[in-house]
């Protein structure tokens, strides 16, 4: 989907020497690291499914698209891609599925053109707050990143080291305000239970936000007001029960927005009335005719757009004196 692509038709393969061999000399312009395939014409290097345990040191200076997927990298240390001369052209870096569990502060420093980074499908138990900003200054130099893909980076539940995974990820996104230019952020399939309230306000350039396949129950404390450029908001496959008036008004106020809400367990009681009214009027929800009630039982599978106020009742709560045992 959002991984770096290549028009390479012919790749040169390297000689099969050890991938972790360190070259003290700057790489030759046409050199290709061991266990990788290189195309200078396409400015692309692919080191895919080769069980590499470190980032190759001898990457060619021309590389614009770097695939390091399906490896055994485990750790990205500070300056993992720092080279002399620097990899000044590197614009798209795909590290998905490489068994990374630790990304340290400054891991992506000295990549002045890096616009697209994919860390998906890595169990990131230890993501430094300064992984993307590179420094612990309150305001860092702006990152060139425009697209950050962090789908399915949650470690197994017993390996999360007793801290909020959401908080760890958000700290990395907000540190030093380095990601002010970020336009696409994908955080799908991460078991997020909540969205920390600061996160969106500090990413004002976002065009595309994917929070699908998480466990979000409510958006009550999340503000979309500042995201005036937002074009797509993916909230499919979460645990949303209802969207309240404040959220509805904010979404309606975004000029270019398309919202995706499929496969949430909507609760069709009296609290749903405002959302149903809004759905009938709005054009921002894609596939709104597919949204159905999950609860209460009597409303299961009813289409939200077909409901009227008489359908949306709440069982009265009896005062204790009137309750029977």
């Amino acid at each position: 989907s959002s991984s770096p692509t290549s028009s390479a038709s012919s790749f040169s393969s390297s000689a099969p020497f050890l991938a972790s061999a360190v070259s003290a000399q700057p790489p030759l312009p046409d050199q290709c690291p061991a266990l990788c395939e290189c195309s200078e014409a396409a400015r692309t290097v692919k080191c895919v499914n080769r069980n590499l345990t470190e980032v190759p040191t001898d990457l060619p200076a021309y590389v614009r698209n770097l695939f390091l997927t399906g490896n055994q990298l485990a750790v990205l240390p500070a300056g993992a891609f720092a080279r002399r001369p620097p990899l000044a052209e590197l614009a798209a870096l795909n590290l998905s599925g490489s068994r990374l569990d630790e990304v340290r502060a400054g891991a992506f420093e000295h990549l002045p053109s890096l616009r697209q980074l994919d860390l998906s499908h890595n169990p990131l138990a230890d993501l430094s707050p300064f992984a993307f900003s590179g420094s612990n200054a309150s305001v860092s130099a702006p990152s060139p990143l425009v697209e950050l893909i962090l789908n399915h980076i949650v470690p197994p539940e017993d390996e999360r080291q007793n801290r909020s995974f959401e908080g760890m990820v958000v700290a990395a996104l907000l540190a030093g305000r380095a990601l002010q230019g970020l336009r696409r952020l994908e955080l799908a399939s991460n078991h997020f239970l909540y969205l920390p309230r600061d996160v969106l306000a500090q990413l004002p350039s976002l065009r595309h936000l994917d929070l699908s396949n998480n466990s979000l129950v409510s958006l009550t404390y999340v503000s979309f007001r500042n995201l005036t450029h937002l074009e797509s908001l993916h909230l499919e496959d979460n645990a949303l029960k209802v969207l309240h008036n404040g959220t509805l008004a904010e979404l309606q106020g975004l000029p270019h927005i398309r919202v995706f809400l499929d496969n949430n367990p909507w609760v069709c009681d009296c609290h749903m009335a405002d959302m149903v009214t809004w759905l009938k009027e709005t054009e921002v929800v894609q596939g709104k005719d597919r949204l159905t009630c999950a609860y209460p039982e009597k409303m299961r599978n009813r289409v939200l757009l077909e409901l009227n106020s008489a359908d949306l009742d709440c069982d009265p709560i009896l005062p204790p004196s009137l309750q029977t045992s």
């Epitope: 069980n51 345990t53 055994q72 485990a74 490489s98 068994r99 990374l100 569990d101 138990a125 390996e159």
Partner: nanobody, 122 residues
Framework: EVQLVESGGGEVQPGGSLRLSCAAS????????MAWFRQAPGKEREFVAA????????RYTESVKGRFTISRDNAKNTLYLQMSSLRAEDTAVYYC???????????????WGQGTLVTVKP
């Protein structure tokens, strides 16, 4: 400090198999990497294989690739080394180690077991 206890060593013929185990006294959260080293008589201790507790990334020294498999059982706090196609040159005391780094150097590891002897002879 985590206590590491190896078991499973023994005598085996060339081409045979053994499985070594290393039980940790507790989950070594502070040690992100578990490894096997070996030391043959009169030689330096050398890296064999390593695995990350989280994520399960693995790495091997060249001479054992395709013959040895390192794994871990997080629920049991146990590290394993499945060794097959054993050769005479695999004879050594095998040590389990725990450390922070994703490395192959002796100094990358802070906690060590006492070792278990593997002997490969006809």
């Amino acid at each position: 400090e985590v206590q590491l206890v190896e078991s499973g060593g023994g005598e085996v013929q060339p081409g045979g198999s053994l499985r070594l185990s290393c039980a940790a006294s507790r989950r070594p959260f502070s040690s992100k990497t578990m490894a096997w080293f070996r030391q043959a008589p009169g030689k330096e201790r050398e890296f064999v294989a390593a695995v990350r507790w989280i994520g399960g990334a693995t790495r091997y020294t060249e001479s054992v690739k395709g013959r040895f498999t390192i794994s871990r059982d997080n629920a049991k706090n146990t590290l394993y080394l499945q060794m097959s196609s054993l050769r005479a040159e695999d004879t050594a005391v095998y040590y389990c180690a725990a450390g922070q780094a994703w490395g192959t150097k002796f100094t990358d590891y802070s906690d060590w077991g006492q070792g278990t002897l593997v002997t490969v002879k006809p």
